[in-house]
């Protein structure tokens, strides 16, 4: 559910939107830490009819859902966090 | 207080199509998901579609994917679904209910809904 | 597609009694589940969420409880309006109902 990449693309996102999207139609997170040619942190979100938006890292509910995400996926729960290293 | 009326169930033909609407007032509705559930005759309730606040985004189970669109007019209160290429197990009773609260970040489930309008598909 | 297996599918009891419901996801839904009443004829009414929290009006003798995958429902002493059916919901990932559990009068 939660993908931290850290990549050398410039930024994936022209647009952000700060709208709430409940969880239970998200599909996947990828967080893109800032640096390595984009000067923001990113965030896109898969949905589960298929579309993708990019959302504002400020906005109060990706922050909640990021830190629940985080909690589940520090314990046995079935929620993993994929990370790539800088090469 | 929060009313949802449904309207536009009746008697149709397998294959044949029919168009729901749910009338809503009582509260703002241009800031809430809205969502249809269906029960069949003497069944337990079943998911059928949601719609985000604006409109822009639309989630179905994939028994109805394809076959079933849902809509709304946030000007006229108003929430649709269009149901084609009909099935004898669509038959059901189909409630629109209000969602979560799109301005918010709540986790919340659908929490009112109305009393339902009789969909039979029979030849 | 997480399925909410919900037990027993029917229940006897009297008034007074205490009574409780269980729903089994099939993954971890966290704690993303509610409850509802439903009357004959009538359309469901929202009695819990988020496992525990109960809906403004809703009398106190109506609990939840549970995480992960195992939730319970309770009524802690029956009166004539609770006969009905319950269902549980998850709201975790996408919806799924159970299948609902008729309490009758004994």
């Known amino acids: 559910v939660l993908e931290v990449y850290y990549t050398s693309l410039r930024c994936r996102c022209v647009q952000e939107s700060s709208v709430f999207i409940p969880r239970r139609f998200i599909d996947r997170i990828q967080i893109l830490p800032r640096g390595n040619g984009c000067p923001r942190k990113e965030i896109i979100v898969w949905k589960k009819n298929k579309s993708i938006v990019c959302v504002d890292p400020q906005a109060e509910w990706i922050q909640r859902m990021m830190e629940v995400l985080r909690k589940r996926s520090s314990s046995t729960l079935p929620v993993p966090v994929f990370k790539r290293k800088i090469p | 207080e929060v009313q949802l009326v449904e309207s536009g169930g009746g008697l149709v033909q397998p294959g044949g199509s029919l168009r729901l609407s749910c009338a809503a007032s009582g509260f703002t509705f241009s800031s809430y998901a809205m969502s249809w559930v269906r029960q069949a005759p003497g069944k337990g309730l079943e998911w059928v579609a949601t719609?985000?606040?604006?409109?822009?985004?639309?989630y179905y189970p994939d028994n109805v994917k394809g076959r079933f669109t849902i809509s709304r007019d946030n000007a006229k209160n108003s929430l649709y679904l269009q149901m084609n290429s009909l099935r004898a197990e669509d038959t059901a009773v189909y409630y629109c209910?209000?969602?979560?609260?799109?301005?918010?970040?709540?986790?919340?489930?659908?929490?009112?809904w109305g009393q339902g309008t009789l969909v039979t598909v029979s030849s | 597609d997480i399925q909410m297996t919900q037990s027993p599918s029917s229940l006897s009891a009297s008034v007074g009694d205490r009574v409780t419901i269980t729903c089994k996801a099939s993954q971890d839904i966290n704690k993303y589940i509610a409850w509802y009443q439903q009357k004959p004829g009538k359309a469901p009414k929202l009695l819990i969420h988020?496992?525990?929290t109960l809906q403004p009006g809703i009398p106190s003798r109506f609990s939840g409880s549970g995480s992960g995958t195992d939730f319970t429902f309770t009524i802690s002493s029956l009166q004539p309006e609770d006969f009905a059916t319950y269902y549980c919901l998850q709201y975790d990932n996408l919806y799924t109902f159970g299948g609902g559990t008729k309490l009758e009068i004994k």
């Open positions: 988020y496992t525990s």
């Open positions: 209910a209000r969602d979560y609260y799109g301005s918010g970040y709540e986790e919340s489930p659908m929490d009112y």
């Open positions: 719609i985000s606040e604006g409109g822009s985004d639309a």
